[in-house]
Amino acid sequence: VPRWRQQWSGPGTTKRFPETVLARCVKYTEIHPEMRHVDCQSVWDAFKGAFISKHPCNITEEDYQPLMKLGTQTVPCNKILLWSRIKDLAHQFTQVQRDMFTLEDTLLGYLADDLTWCGEFNTSKINYQSCPDWRKDCSNNPVSVFWKTVSRRFAEAACDVVHVMLNGSRSKIFDKNSTFGSVEVHNLQPEKVQTLEAWVIHGGREDSRDLCQDPTIKELESIISKRNIQFSCKNIYRPDKFLQCVKNPEDSSCTSEI
């Protein structure tokens, strides 16, 4: 008799999830000498232990603590780039500016980037059919709790000038409900962080508006200022040119507005 299985509203676990996590871990530790000591089998066991046999709407940050411990990593605290709704450009940027780091440039972020996973209560099975959707089902699901946990830790580690890349094409350039707006902003440490510098990325070719004056950016400035952190904002009118100029700042085409 087939066992009844809970149907969730979100997509199921990414196919070949265990193999993908293990392979990513091996690749990352080969590329990053400071993480060579990491035992990837133990990392997978800790990852699996966070959600297997647990109800996928009842996951806590505590469940991920063994994984967090194994994935402990020191990144330069003054070279952190946060992002919201503009992941691809943020990752392209850190591929050029190699001394800066997004969360997905760290081991734990790299392992989980773009993956979905969940288990089932009281069985050791991974659910490849469906997983809880944050809105339609529950917020305490394995994926959401993982990103909330690692994002909080990443923000807590930041110091000096922290950068955030924001999508100027969206109706809410700063969204209080995003991971950046709901987790990272509130976990920057005022005793360590001097300034939050926002980079607003323009979408339109001929868009010369100052999006730093957008009401949602003013809201971000207000939240940050109340936390005794300074705020600055820059428009990036031409993201393609921005990346090119980060690569080669002395190029003659990089001496006017970008």
């Epitope: 003054n78 820059k234 100029c245 980060v246």
Partner: nanobody, 123 residues
């Protein structure tokens, strides 16, 4: 943060000038200071900058070989040596600074500006 540029003046084509910029108000070396110019009717243009974080100088390819940026030892003054000047180097020259860790010569990248010093090159 305050920046004060000086040293401009009237010079003949082929001549030289040395501009100075005094920077104050930063509590650490986590900033970049740059030189810019704006000629009448044209947009502001980046010329050179110094990243205080790693001590590296960057010069725009358009002025490399003629303009050279330098810094004094106590770090609160930077200079721009202008050589082989041409009439189309006539402009107001500015210094500016940014706390961003990203080094760029684009004027909109810099949040702190000094008042300009006029350089006029006659033929």
């Amino acid at each position: 943060v305050q920046l004060q540029a000086s040293g401009g003046g009237l010079v003949q084509a082929g001549g030289s000038l040395r501009l100075s910029c005094t920077v104050s108000g930063f509590t650490s070396d986590d900033y970049t200071v740059g030189w810019f110019r704006q000629a009448p009717g044209l947009k502001r243009e980046g010329l050179s900058c110094l990243s205080r974080r790693d001590g590296r100088f960057y010069h725009s390819n358009s002025v490399k070989g003629r303009f050279t940026m330098s810094s004094d030892d106590n770090k609160n003054t930077v200079y721009l040596q202008l050589d082989s000047l041409k009439p189309d180097d006539t402009a107001v020259y500015y210094c500016a600074a940014t706390t961003s860790v990203v080094v760029l010569l684009a004027p909109n990248w810099y949040e702190y500006w000094g008042q300009g010093t006029q350089v006029t090159v006659s033929s």
